[in-house]
Interface confidence: medium
Amino acid sequence: EYSNCGENEYYNQTTGLCQECPPCGPGEEPYLSCGYGTKDEDYGCVPCPAEKFSKGGYQICRRHKDCEGFFRATVLTPGDMENDAECGPCLPGYYMLENRPRNIYGMVCYSCLLAPPNTKECVGATSGASANFPGTSGSSTLSPFQHAHKELSGQGHLATA
């Protein structure tokens, strides 16, 4: 019976079986609903709107990573319909805590206002003042979002999974 169907399955009246909802391709998201035994008559896939992306399947389109606002970092690569944005070095006034890579929200840049004393990226920095990320001074060519780190969500960084 339809109540036994899974999250992405609908009940096929003809076969009497649960059937997989048609998955969407990269850059698309489901239109209307399908799952737990029911499927809207006009269910289908539609392209992601501007500023959003999807890897396909049953994912809804999500906004590109907010490098500046959320991660406090510069934009390395803007996103498209199929790919998230990639973030680069930290913005001025923020620093990468390289010895603490276990952030469940992704590799974010932290505020210099709360930095430990003598944090090199924040020396002389106050709110909004310049704070250089080590990668900009030749010590590393990686952005904070390219450092090897412990994977926490099993699905990549927050906002990219």
Partner: antibody
Framework: EVQLKKSGPELVKPGASVKMSCKAS????????IHWVKQKPGQGLEWIGY????????KYDEKFRGKATLTSDKSSSTAYMELRSLTSEDSAVYYC??????????????WGQGTSITVSS | DIVMTQSPASLSMALGEKVTIRCITS??????MNWYQQKPGEPPKLLIS???SLRPGVPSRFSSSGYDTDFVFTIENILSEDVADYYC?????????FGTGTKLVLK
């Protein structure tokens, strides 16, 4: 620091769904992650999941996947949690809690007062 | 999932005594342990965050120590206002997991 305002208590029937809200005021809503935590009467705390309001990225504890759905509305700075197919096991206080992503650490540091859900016929 | 073993489940202490609560994790979480206080009818309050860091405004009689899998939370010279439930939370990995809680009451 973000302030979180809960929705009112609810008495709901078994099998029904309920949607509770958590309105944030203070710093920019999209620079915070909103977590949801369950506490049954006289019992401990259980983490349900979190949502990043900027792009609606969600992460759930597997035991709540299919039971809870987290959403948010940036225009009103409000996070929502919908619970479906309610049973008496879902009777609890549900807390929303926030974490500023750009301050060191992962733990929730600001909590709402909690929304009480009672499931009874 | 990371399993949290918190002990004791309850403590009956006299004013001015020292309280010690322990949390053991099923896997190494480095120093990603947090401690919350919850008073009746209130939401939890974060007292100590990762790296054994006392939160701003929290009295210095609260402290914690530990690394990897073994963590201890201490209240020196308890006051009547410390009567509450205390929870540990690991924030090293999702799903975040809480300890089962310790109820602190006065003798």
């Amino acid at each position: 620091e973000v302030q979180l305002k809960k929705s009112g208590p609810e008495l709901v029937k078994p099998g029904a769904s309920v949607k509770m809200s958590c309105k944030a005021s203070g710093p920019a809503f999209t620079t915070y992650v909103i977590h949801w935590v369950k506490q049954k009467p006289g019992q401990g705390l259980e983490w349900i999941g979190y949502i990043n309001p900027y792009n609606d990225y969600t992460k759930y504890d597997e035991k709540f996947r299919g039971k809870a759905t987290l959403t948010s509305d940036k225009s009103s700075s409000t996070a929502y949690m919908e619970l479906r197919s309610l049973t008496s096991e879902d009777s609890a206080v549900y807390y929303c809690a926030s974490k500023a992503a750009y301050y060191v650490g992962n733990a929730m540091d600001s909590w709402g007062q909690g929304t009480s859900i009672t499931v009874s016929s | 999932d990371i399993v949290m073993t918190q002990s004791p489940a309850s403590l009956s202490m006299a004013l001015g005594e020292k309280v010690t609560i322990r949390c053991i994790t099923s896997t190494n979480i480095d120093d990603d342990m947090n401690w919350y206080q919850q008073k009746p009818g209130e939401p939890p309050k974060l007292l100590i965050s990762e790296g054994n860091s006392l939160r701003p405004g929290v009295p210095s009689r609260f402290s914690s120590s530990g690394y990897d899998t073994d963590f201890v939370f201490t209240i020196e010279n308890i006051l009547s206002e410390d009567v509450a439930d205390y929870y540990c939370l690991q924030s090293d990995n999702v799903p975040l997991t809480f300890g089962t809680g310790t109820k602190l009451v006065l003798k």
